[in-house]
Interface confidence: medium
Amino acid sequence: GELETSDVVTVVLGQDAKLPCFYRGDSGEQVGQVAWARVDAGEGAQELALLHSKYGLHVSPAYEGRVEQPPPPRNPLDGSVLLRNAVQADEGEYECRVSTFPAGSFQARLRLRVLVPPLPSLNPGPALEEGQGLTLAASCTAEGSPAPSVTWDTEVKGTTSSRSFKHSRSAAVTSEFHLVPSRSMNGQPLTCVVSHPGLLQDQRITHILHVSFLAEASVRGLEDQNLWHIGREGAMLKCLSEGQPPPSYNWTRLDGPLPSGVRVDGDTLGFPPLTTEHSGIYVCHVSNEFSSRDSQVTVDVLDPQEDSGKQVDLVSAS
């Protein structure tokens, strides 16, 4: 006769491991008992369990409640056992020793491999600001056994670097994603992808990029200078900028206080019916936590009764 087993049994942490040991004997042969032991190199054999044809399954106190026979129907020549709820410490070499009559004893070894799936974590880097050089956007760490694979999935241009730390029964892998921040990256997803033989599918953690910036400010509303004349209603100036975080707007007049009746509504400055006292230099001040910008314009309200033309100067200052 001969023993049938597996060279390697692979199981995911927490699952049940079937340790196979089947005696394929000649007719009339009987299995008296099957002894299972752990036989890691450098250590003595530690009994796991013993299946006896007469006395049944005996389990070592160290494995009490964790070793069972497979569910019926059972073949009397089958000495397989189930190791419940596999833990990392179960990984190692096991020996099955079968005592048969009249052929004698047979033994076989197998290796139990316990896969420990990773629980990845993603840590964003420092705040990203436009104008910085190469900056850490995020790091992703995953620990498992064997070592997991950590990669990045993104449309953003950047560079990656990885390092690995080996522990006694596992390995931790950390991958960093570096980039040169630009406003076009705002709202873009940066996804850490972790692959491992113990996972049914890749694990993905997505971080949305936020890049602080503030665009140059400009003022609209003075494009047609002939519209800025005494008596005109609905005249307005609009300050244009964009930023992350979204900016706030403030209007002032450089050559004095804002005239009465002028309404400030965020980025817009609304005028009552125009008079010559509305002529002056107006400043839009745009700011967010990252930066601030100014843009100033000169308003010259025309008196239609005068022949002189209206002159408008546009000046931007940062």
């Epitope: 008296g32 009994e47 369990a49 013993l50 006896h52 005996h58 070592s60 106190p61 009249p102």
Partner: nanobody
């Protein structure tokens, strides 16, 4: 030939404890399985518990959680700690040992009486 000698039996009240011992006349390392059976008056011999040379154990459902089998290979002795005894545990308790070579050879002791009164 292996001689097995039991001791520790006696009379005890329900809920009490006893510890049986079985000494073997040769090294228990070569004895693959040792254990205990019992036989009540007018009944068949009944399996109680067994222990392997490596310390793995098995129990009959009727005693699981109340009885504990242990083994001292250095002293060539097997023990049965019996707690929470019940009147239905009254029987003659026999030590058994099995040697595995080309075929199983089973040895028996002469038995020790355990009586549990209510």
């Amino acid at each position: 030939e292996v001689q097995l000698v039991e001791s520790g039996g006696g009379l005890v009240q329900a809920g009490g404890s006893l510890r049986l011992s079985c000494a073997a006349s040769r090294s228990t390392f070569s004895l693959n399985i040792m254990g205990w059976y019992r036989q009540a008056p007018g009944k068949q011999r009944e399996y109680v518990a067994t222990i392997t040379s490596g310390g793995s154990t098995n129990y009959a459902d009727s005693v699981r959680g109340r009885f504990t089998i242990s083994r001292d290979n250095a002293e060539n002795t097997v023990y049965l700690q019996m707690d929470s005894l019940k009147p239905e545990d009254t029987a003659v308790y026999y030590c058994t040992a099995e040697l595995v070579r080309r075929g199983p050879t089973t040895y028996w002791g002469r038995g020790t009486q355990v009586t549990v009164s209510s």
